[in-house]
């Protein structure tokens, strides 16, 4: 695995610890809570930054609504149990023995239930729509610029491959941002659109996973983008399933 | 060249608490994880935790949670482990290792809990 | 955990003989495999690190193998001196784990 040889450091995850013993001498940098060595030339998975964070210390016109299978993650931080490749686990349990079913990006998609709850897969996000409001500016931004400097960022600051960046719009206040990516279009190396919204929802909240990098300063045509609140749905390859109780 | 040394053999009561040392040369203390094996006569090498000396960043096995503690004294590059409310399942030796390759060891040091 | 199996528990040898020591890991683990001599009373000495990497001062008799979950440590012409207890160790993720060991014993 990549990291920066000179200083042996992490550029893309901070909840790393790293140090000169990979193979052939290499540095080798290794999640905080796992211990999993991480590539650090791209992004590190969500689930393995939860286990560190965890360890560590409408209007809708041009907008889009939500369909009815959107989950929201309401459920907050856990301690996530990560595969070997750094995935969720299709199951999750806390140390009280309740279970339930996680999409690709960790969030609940089933009721909860007890240690004998099967997941029988993983089940793939494959459309994330971040809804963003922004504090309020002389004018409203430019539709064309603020649409090419967010795609700019999920390129340079994300690495991820601009045809997963489906769709920007907007409506003073409001922002929202589409990605999409199906199983089959992901390709080995590509980063995974859920990795990329988790650093994106990190960076908006002041708590950049970069290393030593600054805060995110988001401007378009020189005017701060600033944003005081943040709403991110997840659409399932495969909808949810909740019992309607839930849903009332 | 890179060196750990441990402090001597202990024999100690049930129920008392021990702490174990470790001192490093030879390499950057700070910059390499520092971990600890249990080996019972007889048994296997049993991995207790390790510690990064830079960071202060400890991890455990569950089994030695409550067990052992891991500290580090950078000043003098030092590795410690207390182990706490010792019974005769302590016994055995206890090594220190520079991780996660484990390429330096110890010598060892051998715990006897009695009474 | 990652459950590390070594097999067999005991080897026995003549000097002079080619042997192969056996270590499969619970999941993949890529190469983060390593393999340690032991002899009696002495610290574990480091012989192989990921899988197949040679170490300064231990002789080119030992050698490794493997990826994945199947992982082999080889001496191709078995002395005396490598009479010990053997034993492999997993540095994929915490907690690290050791193989319950392979006795060597010489005929």
């Known amino acids: 695995h990549t990291a920066a040889q000179d200083n042996c450091t992490c550029p893309t995850n901070k909840m790393t610890v790293c140090s000169p013993d990979g193979p052939g001498g290499r540095c080798q940098c290794r999640a905080l809570g796992s211990g999993m060595a991480v590539d650090c030339s791209t992004l590190t998975s969500k689930c393995l930054l939860l286990k560190a964070r965890m360890s560590a210390p409408k209007n809708a016109r041009t907008l889009v609504r939500p369909s009815e299978h959107a989950l929201v993650d309401n459920d907050g931080l856990y301690d996530p149990d990560c595969d070997p490749e750094g995935r969720f686990k299709a199951r999750q349990c806390n140390q009280t023995s309740v279970c339930w079913c996680v999409n690709s990006v960790g969030v609940r998609r089933t009721d909860k239930g007890d240690l004998s709850l099967r997941c029988d897969e993983l089940v793939r996000t494959h459309h994330i729509l971040i809804d963003l409001r922004h504090r309020p500016t002389a004018g409203a931004f430019n539709h064309s610029d603020l649409d090419a400097e967010l795609r700019r960022l999920f390129r340079e600051r994300y690495r991820l491959h601009p045809k997963f960046v489906a769709a920007v719009h907007y409506e003073q206040p409001t922002i929202q941002i589409e990605l999409r990516q199906n199983t089959s279009q992901k390709a080995a190396g590509d980063v995974d659109i859920g990795d990329a919204a988790y650093y994106f929802e990190r960076d908006i909240k002041g708590e950049s996973l970069f290393q030593g990098r600054g805060g995110l300063d988001l401007r378009v045509r020189g005017e701060p983008l600033q944003v005081e609140r943040t709403l991110i749905y997840y659409l399932d390859e495969i909808p949810p399933k909740f019992s309607m109780k839930r849903l009332t | 060249q890179v060196q750990l040394q441990q402090s001597g053999a202990e024999l100690v009561r049930p129920g008392t608490s021990v702490k174990i040392s470790c001192k490093a040369s030879?390499?950057?203390?700070?910059?390499?994880?520092l971990g600890w094996v249990k080996q019972r006569p007889g048994h296997g090498l049993e991995w207790i935790g390790n510690i990064f000396p830079g960071g202060g960043y400890t991890n455990y096995n569950e089994k030695f949670k409550g067990k052992a503690i891991l500290t580090a004294d950078t000043s003098s590059s030092t590795a410690y482990m207390q182990l706490s409310s010792l019974t005769s399942e302590d016994s055995g030796v206890y090594f220190c290792a520079r991780e996660g390759v484990m390429d330096y060891w110890g010598q060892g040091t051998t715990l006897t809990v009695s009474s | 955990d990652i459950l590390l199996t070594q097999s067999p528990a005991i080897l026995s040898v003549s000097p002079g003989e080619r042997v192969s020591f056996s270590c499969r890991a619970s999941q993949n683990i890529g190469t983060s495999i390593h393999w340690y001599q032991q002899r009696t009373n002495g610290f574990p000495r480091l012989l192989i690190k990921y899988a197949s990497e040679s170490i300064s001062g231990i002789p080119s008799r030992f050698s490794g193998s493997g990826s994945g979950t199947d992982f082999t440590l080889s001496i191709n012409s078995v002395e005396s001196e490598d009479i010990a207890d053997y034993y492999c160790?997993?540095?994929?993720?915490?907690?690290?784990?050791f193989g319950s060991g392979t006795k060597l014993e010489i005929k």
């Open positions: 160790q997993q540095s994929y993720s915490w907690p690290f784990t």
């Open positions: 030879g390499y950057t203390f700070t910059n390499y994880w």
